[in-house]
């Protein structure tokens, strides 16, 4: 019998070894009460996986995205 959860984060565990070249596209989810949720669609198996926001290339991607967003 499933236990009801008081919250629902779509990402529970995160991949910390995902190559940028294997990512088809990225989604950044803003889910209340959840850690930063970044979802990648992988090229090699078409899976949607949650990836670690601490990955170096993800940090760079987020930095660029934010700069682009707030550029005057």
């Amino acid at each position: 019998k499933p236990v009801s959860l008081s919250y629902r984060c779509p990402c529970r565990f995160f991949e910390s070894h995902v190559a940028r070249a294997n990512v088809k596209h990225l989604k950044i989810l803003n889910t209340p009460n959840c850690a930063l949720q970044i979802v990648a669609r992988l090229k090699n198996n078409n899976r949607q996986v949650c990836i670690d926001p601490k990955l170096k290339w993800i940090q760079e991607y987020l930095e660029k995205a934010l700069n682009k967003r707030f550029k005057m």
Partner: nanobody, 124 residues
């Protein structure tokens, strides 16, 4: 009846060890990723550790890395969480859950089978 049953919880002193078990009945765990979660009083439920079905890849929360080890015995349809160097902060109800997609990092995972939990208390 399909269910997950946790066991192995209890009261342990700081620095001590416990081994939790998650046994499946009514289905086999072979094709499922199995995650351990915990919930302390007044806190949100958090993912502690997880093991994939196919490749056996393991995942750990930063707070338990180097102290906890997850393993699976498909022949016994059981997953274990070995917890060493326990701290008072580890006190919580520990739950196991099964993910049919077979991998822990799946988007929208762990919506299906959950156990009822086992209490772990770390106190002197």
């Amino acid at each position: 009846e399909v269910q997950l049953v946790e066991s192995g919880g209890g009261l342990v002193q700081p620095g001590g060890s416990l081994r939790l078990s998650c046994a499946a009945s009514g289905f086999t765990l072979d094709d499922y990723a199995i995650g351990w979660f915990r919930q302390a009083p007044g806190k949100e439920r958090e993912g502690v550790s997880c093991i994939n079905s196919n490749d056996g890849n393991t995942y750990y929360a930063d707070s338990v890395k180097g102290r906890f080890t997850i393993s699976r015995d498909n022949a016994k349809s059981t997953v274990y969480l070995q917890m060493n160097s326990l701290k008072p902060d580890d006190t919580a109800v520990y739950y196991c859950a099964a993910e049919a997609m077979g991998y822990c990092s799946a988007y929208g995972s762990f919506e299906g089978y959950w156990g009822q939990g086992t209490q772990v208390t770390v106190s002197s």
